[in-house]
Structures are given as C-alpha cells and as structure tokens.
Interface confidence: low
Amino acid sequence: EDLKKVFPPKVAVFEPSEAEISHTQKATLVCLATGFYPDHVELSWWVNGKEVHSGVSTDPQPLKEQPALEDSRYSLSSRLRVSATFWHNPRNHFRCQVQFYGLSEDDEWTEDRDKPITQKISAEAWGRADC
Amino acid sequence: PYIQNPDPAVYQLRGSKSNDTSVCLFTDFDSVMNVSQSKDSDVHITDKTVLDMRSMDFKSNGAVAWSNKSDFACTSAFKDSVIPADTFFPSPESSC
C-alpha cells in the first residue's frame, strides 16, 4: 500500500521590488510556503524579533498546487508591507515563520519538544541600505 | 474595502536566497477588480487579499503569482485578469 507521506513546507522570503519602492515609497515583502501536505500551517511575520500584524496580509487558506489531484500539496503566500525608509534601514530584520503541524516518520524535524511533531521553518531578509 | 487611490501595478520580486521561483506582486488595484486563476497548472495565483498598514492609515489589495518555470514572466502572469497594460514595472538590475 502506498502510504500517504507528509511534506513540510519550503519557506522563502522575496524582497521588495525597487520599482515598487520608488513608485510608492512602500516596500512589500512576500513570503511563500510551498510544497506542504497536509494543509496545516500557521504563518507569521517577525520584525526585529517581534511578531507583527499591521501591514500583513496572508491567504485565508492554502492553495492546492495541483487542483486536479485529491492529495495535492499546498502553498500559502503572505505579504508584509512597510515604508520604504523602514525597509532601507539595514538594522531592520524581517522573518517569515511557518509553523507546520505535520506528521513525521521520526520527529527529527522537531525544535519544540513539548509538541513532538511541530516544525518551525523560517526564511528571513535584512533591510537593504541604498547602494 | 474602499481603496482611496488605486494605483494598480505588477512588480517582480527577488528571492533572498538562490531560488528557482519567480514571484510577481499585483498590488494597489481597485476592489472591483477580480484576479483570475491561471490556466497554466505550473503558474500559481492567489486570490486577492487586503492589507492594512494601520500606522499609515493605508489599505491595499494584492495578489501574488509565482512559478518555477524558467520562461515565467510578470508581464504574462496575470494575463487572464483584465488589468491595464501600463501596470507592469520591470525590475531594474541590481547594482549592489
């Protein structure tokens, strides 16, 4: 029998477009969590070590990567928008964290021993100085 | 929500680490505009969501398209949605 496997997400942060910054004086970071199954994720943005909610918009539910497949893997996107000056301050640190409530063969993903099969996965970016 | 000054634009974003994925951000469009799903199974497009920059009293609509296809381009990412031709902002090559 082909037992269903569980797949943790790959997480990547995409930096704001300089075109957006110059055009709007705002900067949007995008976080993508892709390739996960089942659809158990909780996404959060952290700026300088603190969770932020203002300026954040996350898909209300994960997207099936292959809608025709019943057991398709899922993706989720989120945006964080800040002022251009805040983005360009190199001291500012942005992190997208995706918590995955999946099931592993051996719990080796674990970072939190109280929840044996919780995985925290993150991707991050630093503010960019003008160059 | 009512978007005060819609300024629709599509921007290309760059991954913070070496990444095969290309991401296009469609943002600042009017609430009456709908974002269509891609007919290409290798191109993923999210539904529109609203972002609220509370400190700046600013709200914006947005949607994201991405793909691992090498020929994926932001100019065609939202081709199934009715958006103006002048919304595409090419990404200048970084000089950093």
Epitope: D39, H40, D71, Y101, T118 | -
Partner: nanobody, 117 residues
C-alpha cells in the same frame, strides 16, 4: 474546542489483543489528522499510528503488521486495534487530533495498556 476521550486500555497477556477508542467532540469537522501515541515509564512519548481525512495511514515501525488504526466518521471515533501484544507495548496510550483551526493541536488524557503474564 476539540475534546478527546480515550478508552479500551487494560491488562492483557502477551500475544493478546486490545482495541482502543478515541472519541472526539466539538469542532470535529475541522480535524484532518488523528494519531495514537504512547509513553512508556521513563521514556519519551512516541508515535504509534496516524490516520488522515482520506483514511491514509502511517505507522511506527514497531506497530507495522500488528496494529491497525481506523476511523468511524459517523461516531467521531478513531480506533487502534492492537494484536500480538508484547510486554514492551506497555504504556500510556494517547489520542491526538490536529485541527485546521487554532489551537490546532489536541491531546487526550491517555488510557493505560499493560501487557504482562
């Protein structure tokens, strides 16, 4: 909030069988994974078996071929049929549910299984 109540534990001789039950209440339509775990005295809690909404199953190596996880959606119940029990199966057995909505992760209080001659 989901509540999980396990039952079916007890004392059994080596080679015997038991069937554990886990009844879920409240937001059961939001649950998309159930699991059975066990914790033996002095050891860490470990996975025994999982079942998803598509009734896809996944077993720990120690459970393969001996234990069967199943689900009765109409009764909001998940079962663990344990055959060919061994003394090393002695443990407190916990039911776990993973939900699509916060707080996502629910555990029952456990039911004790003792395998002894």
């Amino acid at each position: 909030e989901v509540q999980l109540v396990e039952s079916g534990g007890g004392v059994v001789q080596p080679g015997g069988s038991l069937r554990l039950s886990c009844v879920a209440s409240w937001d059961v339509h939001q649950i998309n994974f159930y699991g059975w775990y066990r914790q033996a005295p002095g050891k860490e809690r470990e996975k025994v078996a999982h079942i998803s909404i598509g009734d896809q199953t996944d077993y720990a190596d120690s459970a393969k071929g001996r234990f069967t996880i199943s689900r009765d959606e109409s009764k909001n119940t998940v079962y663990l049929q344990m055959n060919s029990l061994r003394p090393e199966d002695t443990a407190l057995y916990y039911c776990r549910a993973l939900s699509r909505i916060w707080p996502y992760d629910y555990w029952g209080q456990g039911t004790l299984v003792t395998v002894s001659s």
